[in-house]
C-alpha cells in the first residue's frame, strides 16, 4: 500500500467523501499516518 504523503491525502479525501465528512476535526493528512487506513 502506498504510504507517501500524497497517497495519504487522497485516501483521506476518499474516506471523508464516503463518510459524508463525519469524522473528528483533527482527521487531516498532516495529523494521520498511513496506519490510520
Amino acid at each position: 500500500s502506498c504510504n507517501t504523503a500524497t497517497c495519504v491525502t487522497h485516501r483521506l479525501a476518499g474516506l471523508l467523501s464516503r463518510s459524508g465528512g463525519v469524522v473528528k476535526d483533527n482527521f487531516v493528512p498532516t495529523n494521520v499516518g498511513s496506519e490510520a487506513f
Epitope: C2, T4, A5, T6, C7, T9, H10, L12, A13, L16, V28, P29, T30, N31
Partner: antibody
Framework: EVQLLQSGPELMKPGTSVKISCKAS????????MNWVKQSHGKSLEWIGD????????TYNQKFKGKATLTIDKSSSTAYMELRSLTSEDSAVYYC????????????WGQGTTLAVSS | DIVMTQSQKFMSTSVGDRVSVTCKAS??????VAWYQQKPGQSPKALLY???YRYSGVPDRFTGSGSGTDFTLTISNVKSGDLAEYFC?????????FGGGTKLEIK
C-alpha cells in the same frame, strides 16, 4: 479562495544562498503537506521534497539533500525553501504546491519564483 | 528512482479531434499517477489524480486510464485552449517523479 503566493524573482551570485517563500491563504495551512518542485528552463519538473506544516517534518529527494532546506512558519502560514551553495545549475523556476481537501479538493500551485544564478 | 517516460515529446492534433498522451512507469506504481497541464508562461495545473479521477472544475473532456506501468491521458473534442504541455507524475514512491512532458500542438 485558496492561494499560494510566492516571493519574487531572485538574481544571485554563485556560492551564495537564497530563501524563497510561499504564503498560503484560504485554507488551514497546517492540515496539508507542502511540496516544492523545480523546473529548469524548457525542461520537465523535479520534485524537491515536502514538509508537514503541522510539525515541520520533511521528506527530501536525495538529489536535493544538502542543497534545499524546507521550513515553515505556522504563525504566518508561510513555507520556505532555502537553497545553498548556488551554482548556475540551480537557475530555474521553483514552485510550491499543496493538495487540499477543504474547502476544495484540489492540487494548488504557486505562481513560481524565478531564480537566476550568475556572476 | 522510478522513471516516468513520455515517449512522444510533441503531438499534433486539430480542434475537435481526440488525442491520447501516454506515460510509462519503470516499475509498478498502482494507480498513483497524476496528470498536469502547463500552458506557456503559467504554473502547472492539476487535471487528474489516481490515474483517472478529475479534480473539481476539470472538464470531462479530460479522461485518464491505466494502472501498474502504463497510463493514458485522453483529451476529447480538443479546443484551441488545450495548447499546452502535459506531464504525468507518480506519487507511489519517494521521490515523486515526473514524465518529460508532451507538447500538444494545434493544427
Amino acid at each position: 479562495e485558496v492561494q499560494l503566493l510566492q516571493s519574487g524573482p531572485e538574481l544571485m551570485k554563485p556560492g551564495t544562498s537564497v530563501k524563497i517563500s510561499c504564503k498560503a491563504s484560504g485554507y488551514t495551512f497546517t492540515d496539508y503537506y507542502m511540496n516544492w518542485v523545480k523546473q529548469s528552463h524548457g525542461k520537465s519538473l523535479e520534485w524537491i521534497g515536502d514538509v508537514n506544516p503541522n510539525n515541520g517534518d520533511t521528506t527530501y529527494n536525495q538529489k536535493f539533500k544538502g542543497k534545499a532546506t524546507l521550513t515553515i512558519d505556522k504563525s504566518s502560514s508561510t513555507a520556505y525553501m532555502e537553497l545553498r551553495s548556488l551554482t548556475s545549475e540551480d537557475s530555474a523556476v521553483y514552485y510550491c504546491a499543496s493538495i487540499t481537501i477543504v474547502p476544495l479538493y484540489f492540487d494548488f500551485w504557486g505562481q513560481g519564483t524565478t531564480l537566476a544564478v550568475s556572476s | 528512482d522510478i522513471v516516468m517516460t513520455q515517449s512522444q515529446k510533441f503531438m499534433s492534433t486539430s480542434v475537435g479531434d481526440r488525442v491520447s498522451v501516454t506515460c510509462k512507469a519503470s516499475q509498478n506504481v498502482g494507480i498513483n499517477v497524476a496528470w498536469y497541464q502547463q500552458k506557456p508562461g503559467q504554473s502547472p495545473k492539476a487535471l487528474l489524480y489516481s490515474a483517472s479521477y478529475r479534480y473539481s472544475g476539470v472538464p470531462d473532456r479530460f479522461t485518464g486510464s491505466g494502472s501498474g506501468t502504463d497510463f493514458t491521458l485522453t483529451i476529447s473534442n480538443v479546443k484551441s485552449g488545450d495548447l499546452a504541455e502535459y506531464f504525468c507524475q507518480q506519487y507511489n514512491t519517494y521521490p515523486y517523479t515526473f514524465g518529460g512532458g508532451t507538447k500538444l500542438e494545434i493544427k
